[in-house]
């Protein structure tokens, strides 16, 4: 696709995973492609096989080591290549000099739990997963609450501009089912983006006490 449009986008999860998506207009679904990673200052290199995720889009994960191992630093540069099989040879389709800490996308927060729930408020906590110690406290969060009769897209975003792994939701309706999600983003990196949303946490507020003014 010489005149078509292609896109090669990769993100580092800050520990031991680089996730990549390669898309190309007009490419055949059964095309066999790989991503090769060559760091500039490490002894290892890594390959993953791109697998189709849509009509003209492929994805794979470069697993660099144990999930919590710190495989790259802010000074590392990894040359990433997309290679696709053409007959008997591999053809380089795309090359990127990848700066891991300029292209961050963390794993979704995990272990969401209700710490305390009342009629009108609920305190929820969570944990971050596989996040580098380099960030120290330089992280921010976004949270959203799904109310009955609404969609996630309609839910207002609550922004936490610091590393705060809990939230107190207020002005809730008694005896009502809600769902809650949170995502995380490092402050570092020109091309850094939000993590995926966490798995939703379902909770129900306490009913109002009978005979009490609510």
């Amino acid at each position: 696709a010489v005149n078509g449009t292609s896109q090669f986008t990769c993100f580092y999860n800050s520990r031991a995973n680089i996730s990549c998506v390669w898309s190309q207009d007009g490419a055949l679904q059964d095309t066999s492609c790989q991503v090769h990673a060559w760091p500039d200052r490490r002894r290892w290199n890594q390959t993953c096989e791109l697998l189709p995720v849509s009509q003209a889009s492929w994805a794979c994960n470069l697993i660099l080591g144990a999930p919590d191992s710190q495989k790259l630093t802010t000074v590392d540069i990894v040359t990433l290549r997309v290679l696709c099989r053409e007959g008997v040879r591999w053809r380089v389709m795309a090359i990127q000099d990848f700066k891991p800490f300029e292209n961050l996308r963390l794993m979704a927060p995990i272990s969401l739990q209700v710490v305390h729930v009342e009629t009108h408020r609920c305190n929820i906590s969570w944990e971050i997963s596989q996040a580098s110690h380099y960030f120290e406290r330089h992280l921010e969060f976004e949270a959203r609450t799904l109310s009955p009769g609404h969609t996630w897209e309609e839910a207002p975003l609550l922004t936490l501009k610091q590393k705060q792994e809990w939230i107190c939701l207020e002005t809730l309706t008694p005896d009502t089912q809600y769902e809650f999600q949170v995502r995380v983003k490092p402050l570092q990196g020109e091309f850094t983006t939000w993590s995926p949303w966490s798995q939703p946490l379902a909770f129900r507020t306490k009913p109002a006490a009978l005979g009490k003014d609510t």
């Epitope: 010489v2 292609s6 896109q7």
Partner: nanobody, 123 residues
């Protein structure tokens, strides 16, 4: 925003050599790798070669492999296309273009373009 200015084009005999230059300016230029494209009279614009700033990784069109060499001088923010063993079919307007992070052979993947420099190869 990235600005690109080509130079070095001209008239040359078949079998001769030329070196084109592409001076790049703009914010964080190392995030914008550079490619050379060409448009011959009455033809579509086609990919020639591309290079990344940091590792110096390169891509070439099959038609120029072994004859053309792309290189860069990071200190001068300049990319060069050394053209040897030139043929009349290399006659074209040569453009340099900057991509967003990734080099490919697709012209639609390049976001910033220079005005071009003319190369004419006589037989």
């Amino acid at each position: 925003q990235v600005q690109l200015v080509e130079s070095g084009g001209g008239l040359v005999q078949a079998g001769g050599s030329l070196r084109l230059s592409c001076a790049a300016a703009g914010r964080a230029i190392e995030n914008y790798p550079v490619g050379w494209f060409r448009r011959a009279p009455g033809k579509e614009r086609e990919f020639v070669a591309a290079i990344t700033w940091i590792s110096g990784s390169t891509l070439y069109a099959d038609s120029v492999k072994g004859r053309f060499t792309i290189s860069r001088d990071n200190a001068k923010n300049t990319v060069y296309l050394q053209m040897s063993s030139l043929k009349p079919e290399d006659t074209a307007l040569y453009y340099c273009a900057a991509a967003l992070k990734t080099i490919t052979r697709g012209q639609n993947d390049y976001s910033y373009w220079g005005q071009g420099t003319q190369v004419t190869v006589s037989s």
